[in-house]
Every structure is written in C-alpha cells, then in structure tokens.
C-alpha cells in the first residue's frame, strides 16, 4: 500500500498538498500580518470555481487567505470587558476565575491519577506477559528483538521506568549485558509514548482540536522511531551508547546517592493507594524465571510485613548442592544443608479497594482500565473546557506569545532549546515524561502551544526522565549500582543523540512533518488513529518478535522484502516531489495502483460499514461516549443527542472548496478534503458540550 | 520412653539369610529414621543403612548393597534388617538405633543388640 | 567414604584428670560429628551431637570442639563412671562413619 492516501488524480509533484504529505505543507504568506489580522483561521475564503489546471485564472484571482489548520485558533472573549462591569461584577468575576482555577486544578490532579491508575491497570492485564518477553533467551543474540521486546513491556506496563528497572535487575544479576540491554531501553523509550498518544485520542469530538493533539502526541513517537531508526543499527555496528557509558561510569567512583525526590507522587500516591496497589517486584521476578512468581498476585494485599532472617535446613538432592561443604550433612537418608531465609509475616493489610475483593489481576487490571479511561477522559474534557474559558481573548493572546514566540534576533534559535531544558525540568519535577507529555497534549489541542514549540518540549521531557533514571541509579545499591547507572546513561545518550539527529537543524525537524501528517490523515479519518496506534505499538513488534523466534532466516527473509519495498515506495515518491521528469510517465504518480492502495477513501467506507451497526445503540449513552462513537466510527449521526456531530457534518457539507494559492509552485487543483483542511466553524462546534 | 526391642541371638549358616527385627515404642514410630549398626568382637561401629519408617525411603552402606534389605511394618512398629549371603566375617552384634535429633544422623537411641554368629 | 581417625586407641588415668580425645576426618565435615560412648556388655549412648551440643543427660564435664576436619572430646575431670569406649561419628556424607574408638581406663 503506497504511503501517501488520496493519490486519486495526482498531476506531476503529487506530494503537495495530500492529507497525509509528510512534508510541512507551503502556505500563501501570512496576510493577517498585514491586516493586523489576531487569527488566520478567521480569514474569508474566496470561493471560487475549480478551474482546469492549466488555466491561469486561479492565479489571478487567488484567494485573499488560505486556511492552515496548523494556525493557531483565536478564542474569542465574547464576555464583557474588566472596565465595562461594577463592583459586584468585578468580584464575581474575581471568585469565578478562583473557581475554575481550583477545579482546573482539581482535574489536573485526577488527570495525573487517572494516568497513575492506567499504568496499574496495564500492569495488571499484561505485566506478567511483559514479564514473560523478557525470560526469552533470543534477546542476546538479536538486538531487533531486543527493542520490540522493550516496547512491547512499556505498552503492556504504560511505564518506562517499570521496564527499564526490570532490565537493570536482570542486568545486575548477569541475566543480561549491557549490549543486550541497549535496544530494549531504545524500545521502552518508543512504548513511554503511546500514553500521551492515547490522551490525544480523548480528544477526538473537534476535528481541528484533535489534528493539533494528535499530531502533537504522535510527534514523540516519530521522534523515537527515527531515532531508533538510525540509531539502533549504529549501535549495533559501533556499540558507541556501550563504549561511551562504560568510559564514564568506570571513570568516576560513584558513592551511592539518594534516591530522586518523588515530587509529584507525595501528591498523588495518597489517592491512588487507596484504588489499588501493586506488588511490581512480581514482574521483575517472572522476567527473571522464578517459577514461583507466575502465580502470584500483582494486587498487593499486605502492606506491613515483618520479615525476620533465619537459617533453615533443607534437604538437597545431592552434597553437591549443598551451599558449602562445611554446612552439608546428612540423617542418614537425606542429604541437608543450611539456607538463609527469609520469613516474611503479614502484619497488616493494605487500605484499597481491591483488597478482600480476591479478583483474578485480569479482572481488577480490565475494571480499572475502563475506569482509569472514563476518569482520564472526563478530566481532559473538562480541562479543555475550563482553559477554553479562561484562555479567551487578550489572556490567551499573552499565553500564546509567551509560549510560542522566539528570543529577538540573533538569539531566536536559542529558543528551542530553552523549551527542552524547561521540558527537561519539568518532567524531573514530575517525576514522568508520561505524565509532562500527556498534559502537554490538549494544550497542544486547544491551541495554547504550537507543535513547532510542543517538539522540543517533547525531547526535553526524553531528557528528564533518564536525568530521573539517573539519579535512581544513584541510589542503588552497590551490586546494581554499575549497570543501572550505565545502563541510565545509555537511556540519556541515546535521547542527546536523538536530539542531535532530529532538532539542531530545522530541515531534519522530520518528526514535526510526519506528525503533521499524520495528523491530518487522522483529522479526516478517526479511525485512522486507532489504526496508527494498534499497527505501530502492538502489530509491528508483535509480528518482528514472532518472526525473530521463528529464527533470524525467517526474519531476514520477510523482513529484508518488506525493508526494500519501503525504500522504493519512499525513492519513487521523493522523485515524484522533487523530479518527476525523470520517471517514465506513468510513475509520476500513483494513478497506476489500485484506489484501496492509494487512497483511506475505500477503507473508510469498510470502516464505515463495520462501525454501521454500532451507529444507533450508542446514540443517547452520556456526551463522553459521543468521542469515543466519533473515534470509532467516525459517523455523523451517532450523537444525536448532543447534535454535535450532526451539526459538524452539516457545516462541512455546506462548505466550498478553495484552490491553494498560487506560490506553491503548482496547479494541482485538490479538495480542502484532501489537503486534510477543515472549516473553521468545525473548530467551534462542541461536541461534549456538558 | 523411648525402648527398641530386639529379637534374639541367631546362628547361621555361610549363604544363608539373617531377618532381625526391631519393635519401637514410646515416640511417633514413622516420624524418625531408624538405623542399623553393627560391632563385631572387639572392633569398633560400622553403619549398615536406615530407613524411614514414614515412607520406607531406605539408604543402604556401599559395602552391604545388594545384601541388606531393611523394611518396616508401620502397624506393628517394627523395623526389619534382613542380611543375606552369609560369611563368617558378618559375625557380629547388630544394634537397631532411632534418631529423634531431627534432621541429623547422630543417634541417640539404641536397642540392646542381637548378636548374629555365622558358622559352619 | 571419610575415613576418621581417632586418638589415641586408648589411655589410662587418674580419676579426677582431664582427658582429651582427637578425631580426625579425612575431608571437610563441617560440625556434622557425634560422640558416643560404649561401656563393656552396653549399647552406644550418645554424647555430643553437632560437635559442642551435649545430649540430654549427659553431664557437662564432656565437652566437644572442633570444626572441618578436627575434631576434640574433653571429659574435664575424669570421674569411675566415665571409663568406657569413645566413638566418634561423622554424618556429613553417606555412608555414616565411625573412629576406632579410645578406651579409656583408671589407672
């Protein structure tokens, strides 16, 4: 299937303007500068006829403005001014924004918990699975299997750092080297960003809301799959990440620190514990083979134990293993020898919810995964209802340039990396680049942040958290000192050699294009989200790792075809954009594919149909289960009773379509559709109005 | 108290076969292994072997394999060393032994002894 | 099979003396040795058991001491009681082993 969907009648230079052009698609310059225009997005819209595309009538009358639906939107003040009101008024309005900024700040506190709660939830359903990934003995040999194994235990855990302890544990107690132990921390890096993607998914109900927050979440993954992209391979050929840290951690005599100031837990762990708890020693000791953990309970029942070492004597099956020579003896029959152990006994039990209920993990893990959803989804539908009433008009304008807007000149590129550092500072002082990237998300959405802003932000957040790592490893104890420090630092390497790959230079901000992309081809067809996320966190690694235990043979053997199908799909199309006359004609565009291969067109309307059925019996549920209907089906009228997504479709048909503006060079005359562009009045209708 | 009681003196034939029982009372019978020792005129102790009663698991002396048989009759609480192929220098007392210090071979009670004479 | 080597075959002493038996076992057997006693026409008794743990009973004039391969039964003030046979035992390894023993007699 050719990358780029809509390919339907593409001219020569196809790749402008398609919904999914990984390319920052060119604009008409920005005429609202000189109207003193606040919102492009405002801006009318010529309508014109669609013109055959040798014509030059479109380029002479051109629209005034092009909608970009990157463009910030500008949220009105339709409230009365500070100065027009009286006194009462005045202190009304006072307690009212002291009102919203507690309840802003209240669902921001269940937002994190709700993110809390979901990664237990995740450790329940599939933290023995993840557990079991890594007692596979492949993982030394292959280091593609390696990274698939990291991302998929981060996605089953929804936590890095649980995978990332797992593997310093396994490396401490030589299950594993350093070499090995690289491409699953690669991987853990990917599967740490589906949380943030998943956040962005809750924001599906607003076309252009869910473009920016999708786009923005999915950044940070194409980030780390480019990354891994170029880096693994460079790993694996040089072991640079390897040789760098050995150098650094032999260099230094580290004494053992504390451990990192948990900041944002002191104030979140005295709810969650109430919820549940979870014993996450039991996912460390399946992934390192103890039979005996597999049939124990993540769910914690008992908090306060007394553990008491003895020494005991047990029978052994010969003298050979017995501990030493000199405490090995026998009654006559069998052979003993003396073990310290160490006798645990429940004191008292843990104070949640779950604790008398003696629920299989799968059962507490699925109830707290649709809770932990309804709640994260509640809380973000709410949060980007009050800071869209609070970041209206002359607020918003200050937010927004403070934010978004560059140092003066000759110091605008120091910018960017000021954001990393404050991203960088923000998630070591919440202790998760989860929880930083997630709550970054529907403000990318509502607007406050642009994406070109929300990117190094993003890569600052990568830092913070292996700076945790690090300071963690700090804290270990002598045995698991050395390699959960080196392997920290290869965590840290791997993110500053990210960084140089994908930020100093604008022209290799490639993330921000594909993210774009995506992003518009998500905008247009919600279902595609899902697709990306299922195919990219779940199907990839999941075929690579069946394929690397079926043998390297098989892998190379299905995975080299596959590889240089890419690469021509990619060639073809770089051609195609840059120098078509170069390709015979029929390969200047992709007219010679069948339409499913070319365009979401078709597969929407499989979708569609599949979804059919689900159209009416989710009509009258409460407003929060309208996004998750519109994500899934992407259907008009399955929300009937907000009339949101009626209203939406109405608006949409109603509308013409523009022609792009004449600077870009070509005359390919191509729907608003297809350049992933939406009406403005999409951008206002709400669809969880509560 | 703990008494092993042991059958009396036998005269035996080279080849033949020695059974000589070993009756325990005053503890839990299947609870501790219970071993055999012999001494022969003026020598010192050789272990033979032990079974426990419990399960019957036996561990026989490399010496005696493929001689010595130890059984026991858990209704009866007797305990059976049976010794077969018979030669002179099997002449010796025959001490039953019950070991109640758990878990190790010391042996801290003893039957009287039955003293097996092997001649022609 | 450890073979333990017991000294000396045996002595003769004033009641009231201190006597000390040594055993020596031909490998490492940690603590895993007992000490019997035998007197003439008698079963066994046991003394120590674990090297240094007296049985129940016996009189805290025996003493034992020793680890690994040597190993020492001391009866601290020899008593007309105390003339007998001394075994000592390893039960480290199967099969169980006994010293020679050391008679011990009054002059």
């Known amino acids: 299937m050719a990358p780029w969907p809509e390919l339907g009648d593409a001219q020569p230079n196809p790749d402008k303007y398609l919904e999914g052009a990984a390319g920052q698609q060119p604009t008409a310059p920005d005429k609202s500068k000189e109207t003193n225009k606040t919102d492009n997005t405002e801006a009318p819209v010529t309508k014109i006829e669609l013109l055959p595309s040798y014509s030059t009538a479109t380029l002479i009358d051109e629209p005034t403005e092009v909608d970009d639906p990157w463009n910030l939107p500008t949220l009105q003040d339709s409230g009365i001014k500070w100065s027009e009101r009286d006194t009462k008024g005045k202190i009304l309005c006072f307690f009212q924004g002291i009102g919203r900024l507690i309840l802003l700040l209240g669902f921001l506190y269940f937002f994190v918990c709700s993110l809390d709660i979901l990664s237990s939830a995740f450790q329940l359903v599939g933290g023995k699975m993840a557990g079991q990934f890594f007692s596979n003995s492949s993982i030394m040999s292959n280091p593609l299997l390696g990274l698939v194994i990291g991302v998929l235990v981060t996605v089953l855990v929804q936590s890095s750092s649980t995978s990332t302890s797992i593997v310093v544990s396994m490396v401490s107690s030589s299950l594993l080297t350093v070499r090995a132990a690289i491409p699953i921390i690669m991987g853990a890096n990917i599967g740490t960003s589906i949380t943030n993607t998943i956040v962005a998914l809750m924001q599906v109900g607003d076309r252009s809301e869910f473009r920016r927050a999708f786009a923005g979440a999915t950044v940070h993954d194409f980030f780390n799959w480019l990354s891994v992209l170029v880096l693994l391979p460079v790993e694996v050929a040089t072991h640079y990440l390897e040789i760098i840290t050995q150098l650094i951690v032999e260099s230094f005599h580290f004494k053992n620190g504390e451990d990192a100031p948990d900041l944002l837990k002191v104030i979140t762990k005295p709810f969650t514990k109430l919820i549940v708890q979870l014993d996450k020693k039991v996912i460390s000791q399946i992934a390192m083979n103890d039979e005996k953990a597999k049939n124990k309970s993540l769910v914690k029942i008992w908090c306060k134990t007394f553990t008491n070492k003895t020494q005991i004597n047990v029978t052994v099956p010969s003298t050979a293993n017995c501990t030493s020579p000199s405490l090995c003896w026998t009654d006559g029959i069998q052979n003993w020898t003396m073990k310290n152990v160490t006798y645990k006994e429940n004191i008292a039990k843990c104070q949640h919810i779950f604790v008398n209920f003696h629920l299989p993990d799968l059962a507490v893990g699925t109830i707290l995964l649709i809770l932990s959803l309804l709640v994260l989804c509640g809380c973000l539908i709410m949060i980007v209802k009050i800071l869209g009433s609070v970041l209206k008009g002359q607020v918003a304008t200050v937010i927004k340039k403070t934010i978004n807007t560059d140092f003066p000149f000759p110091f605008a590129w120091l910018t960017g990396y000021l954001a990393i550092l404050v991203g960088a500072g923000m998630t070591f002082i919440v202790q998760s680049s989860s929880v930083f990237t997630s709550a970054l998300t529907p403000l990318i959405g509502i607007g406050v942040i642009t994406i070109e802003r929300a990117y190094p932000l993003t890569l600052g957040s990568n830092i913070g958290t292996t700076t945790t790592a690090i300071l963690a490893a700090l804290a270990s104890p002598g045995n698991a000192l050395r390699s959960s420090l080196q392997i920290a630092l290869c965590h840290f390497f791997f993110n500053i050699s990210g960084i140089l790959l994908w930020y100093p230079i604008p022209f290799t901000r490639l993330p921000i294009r594909m993210a774009k992309g995506l992003g518009n081809i998500s905008a247009k067809y919600r279902w595609f989200a899902v697709f990306y996320l299922i195919i990219f966190f779940f199907l990839i690694p999941l075929t690579v790792f069946g394929l690397s235990l079926a043998g390297w043979r098989v892998l190379v053997g299905v995975g080299v075809p596959v590889v240089f199908i890419i690469i021509l799909v990619l060639c073809l199309r770089l051609l195609q954009s840059r120098c078509p006359r170069v390709l015979p004609k029929k390969l200047q565009n992709w007219n010679f594919l069948p339409l499913w291969m070319r365009s979401l067109k078709p597969w929407d309307a499989v979708v569609s149909k599949f979804t059919g059925c689900f159209q009416m019996r989710c009509c009258c549920c409460c407003r929060v289960c309208c996004r998750a209907c519109c994500l899934l089906c992407d259907c008009p009228k399955c929300c009937r009773c907000s009339k949101c997504c009626e209203d939406l479709e109405e608006a949409q048909e109603g509308q013409d379509v523009p022609v792009k503006a004449p600077e870009t060079f070509d005359n390919i005359t191509i729907s608003r559709e297809a350049q992933g562009e939406v009406p403005a009045s999409d951008s206002k209708t709400e669809c969880t109005a509560l | 108290q703990v008494q092993l009681v042991q059958s009396g003196a036998e005269v035996k034939k080279p080849g033949a076969s020695v059974k000589v029982s070993c009756k325990a009372s005053g503890y839990t019978f299947i609870t501790y292994n219970m071993h055999w020792v012999r001494q022969a005129p003026g020598q010192g102790l050789e272990w033979m072997g032990a079974?426990?009663?419990?399960?019957?698991?036996?561990s026989y002396n490399q010496k005696f394999k493929g001689r010595v048989t130890m059984t026991r009759d858990t209704s009866t609480s007797t305990v059976y060393m049976e010794l077969s192929s018979l030669r002179s220098e099997d002449t010796a007392v025959y001490y039953c032994?019950?070991?109640?210090?758990?878990?190790?071979?010391?042996?801290?009670?003893w039957g009287q002894g039955t003293l097996v004479t092997v001649s022609s | 099979d450890i073979v333990m080597t017991q000294s000396p075959s045996s002595l003769s002493t004033s009641v009231g003396d201190r006597v000390t038996i040594t055993c020596k076992a031909s490998?490492?057997?940690?603590?895993?040795v007992a000490w019997y006693q035998q007197k003439p026409g008698q079963s066994p008794k046991l003394l120590i058991y674990?090297?240094?743990t007296r049985h129940t009973g016996v009189p805290d004039r025996f003493t034992g001491s020793g680890s690994g391969t040597d190993f020492t039964l001391i009866i601290r003030s020899l008593q007309p009681e105390d003339v007998a046979t001394y075994f000592c035992?390893?039960?480290?390894?199967?099969?169980?082993?006994f010293g020679s023993g050391t008679k011990v007699e009054i002059k």
């Open positions: 674990w090297t240094s």
């Open positions: 035992q390893q039960y480290s390894r199967i099969p169980l082993t």
């Open positions: 490998q490492d057997v940690g603590t895993a």
């Open positions: 032994a019950s070991s109640t210090i758990i878990t190790t071979g010391a042996v801290d009670y």
């Open positions: 079974i426990y009663p419990g399960s019957g698991d036996t």
